[in-house]
């Protein structure tokens, strides 16, 4: 639900199209002041399901650079560094919002787009044992 | 970098403010047609670093609902179901873009905002600090 009664102090919009097209201020406000995102930056190497990060760049998208995780192994890594065939490394995926230039190459007109990105990997048991 | 030369067919903008405020079409285009995000929905339970999903709701934000992962254990789960405290369950975090109503309660005016969300958990070897 994105429809909320308008304040008298809100910028005007043509109700005919509302709320299909909105004004967005691109001066990003970063609410992550209390959390240091670098803290998790080495997890990709220390995980039992380690991953590599691949740069996905698209100048028609905002943000133009997205980092995509690819699990290094199909199995998980044991304490001795060898593969555990009984467990699987799998990507954790999340749907995120991005802005897609529409029409293409236009600097000030965008469409909201949902894309699925792999954020990292986790180690799972392949079989779910169903108890009678 | 969000500045790209404008096509003649682009909606007009006041270059004085450009590209601070842009037009965004909220009819979301979903590019995830080939991938079913539900496929990974049981990983949270089957992972060696399982997590719970908590609903974070904010009507002043778009999307208004975001699911936040919280690791169930400090350690990781072994094959026998017991927790291994020599390993750590840690959240995998990602910075995502959301739209924040600005001014508040306005239906058609937003500011881009970055927030840090926990998407899931992974099992990592703890960092051992060697004392000289």
């Amino acid at each position: 639900g994105i429809a909320i009664p308008r304040n008298s102090g809100c910028p005007n919009s043509e109700d005919k199209n509302f709320p299909r097209t909105v004004m967005v201020n691109l001066n990003i406000h970063n609410r992550n002041t209390s959390t240091n995102p670098k803290r998790s930056s080495d997890y990709y190497n220390r995980s039992t399901s380690p991953w590599n990060l691949h740069r996905n760049e698209d100048p028609e998208r905002y943000p133009s650079v997205i980092w995509e995780a690819k699990c290094r192994h199909l199995g998980c890594v044991k304490a001795d560094g060898n593969v555990d065939y009984h467990m699987n490394s799998v990507p954790i995926q999340q749907e995120i919002l991005v802005l897609r230039r529409e029409p293409r190459h236009c600097p000030n007109s965008f469409r909201l787009e949902k894309i699925l990105v792999s954020v990292g990997c986790t180690c799972v048991t392949p079989i779910v044992h169903h108890v009678a | 970098g969000i500045a790209i030369p404008r096509n003649s067919g682009c909606p007009n903008s006041e270059d004085k403010n450009f590209p601070r405020t842009v037009m965004v079409n909220l009819n979301i285009h979903n590019r995830n047609t080939s991938t079913n995000p539900k496929r990974s929905s049981d990983y949270y339970n089957r992972s060696t670093s399982p997590w719970n999903l908590h609903r974070n709701e904010d009507p002043e934000r778009y999307p208004s609902v975001i699911w936040e992962a919280k690791c169930r254990h400090l350690g990781c789960v072994k094959a026998d179901g017991n927790v291994d405290y020599h390993m750590n369950s840690v959240p995998i975090q990602q910075e995502i873009l959301v739209l924040r109503r600005e001014p508040r309660h306005c239906p058609n005016s937003f500011r881009l905002e970055k927030i840090l969300v926990s998407v899931g958990c992974t099992c990592v070897t703890p960092i051992v600090h060697h004392v000289a």
């Epitope: 199995g75 044991k78 001795d80 060898n82 593969v83 555990d84 065939y85 392949p126 079989i127 | 496929r39």
Partner: antibody, heavy 120, light 107 residues
């Protein structure tokens, strides 16, 4: 050119042992997972054993567990399968196969196979 | 163990025909599926991994699709050199298991 050449097959009596070898060439053997896969006459394919790139991890299905042992000598570029307590149902063509990755999940190169016949 | 049910067990088609083989796993294998071609007296050859990824050098008439438990292998236009037995293999849960095979013949 990647080449895998199996040897050591033959006719053996039930309960006896046999050791198969697979000589690898044309690639850096020590960085690839390897497996043995068998095919009984006129039948389908069955996994026999898996070994990762450095020999630190192995896996055997129940049908051969405790009887067969997979090993590798990376200095000799050779994969082995030690088969003990052989049974008639072990009769098959035995292929050694390479995984395109470190570990041994699926197989991009196969040898020509060596026939093992268990018969009294 | 995960059972892989492949069908049909054999088929006969004309050159140029579209050929479809299905493989059903007894549970979700999360796209960890390979397809192989085996010609008489020869070793198997890997065609597809990850359910859809064509191996280098494999003709584009071969393709794979599917997800969850159900997967399909397609030859878009059957050629005489495609006469072989085709196998699927899951590598989601050990032991890796193969389908029973599909023997493809020319009419």
């Amino acid at each position: 050119e990647v080449q895998l050449v199996e040897s050591g097959g033959g006719v053996v009596q039930p309960g006896r042992s046999l050791r198969l070898s697979c000589a690898a060439s044309g690639f850096t053997f020590s960085t690839y997972g390897m497996s043995w896969v068998r095919q009984a006459p006129g039948k389908g394919l069955e996994l026999v054993a898996i070994i990762n790139h450095n020999g630190g991890s192995t896996f055997y299905p129940d049908s051969v567990k405790g009887r067969f042992t997979i090993s590798r000598d990376n200095s000799k570029n050779t994969l082995y399968l030690q088969m003990n307590s052989l049974r008639a149902e072990d009769t098959a063509v035995y292929y050694c196969a390479r995984d395109p990755r470190h570990d041994g999940y699926f197989f991009d190169y196969w040898g020509q196979g060596t026939l093992v016949t268990v018969s009294s | 163990d995960i059972q892989m049910t492949q069908s049909p067990s054999s088929l006969s088609a004309s050159v140029g025909d579209r050929v479809t083989i299905t493989c059903q796993a007894s549970e979700d294998i999360y796209d960890r599926l390979a397809w192989y071609q085996q010609k008489p007296g020869k070793a198997p050859k890997l065609l597809i991994s990850g359910a859809t990824s064509l191996e280098t050098g494999v003709p584009s008439r071969f393709s794979g699709s599917g997800s969850g438990k159900d997967y399909t292998f397609t030859i878009s236009s059957l050629q005489p050199e495609d006469i072989a037995t085709y196998y699927c293999q899951q590598y989601w849960s050990v032991p890796w298991t193969f389908g029973g095979g599909t023997k493809v013949e020319i009419k």
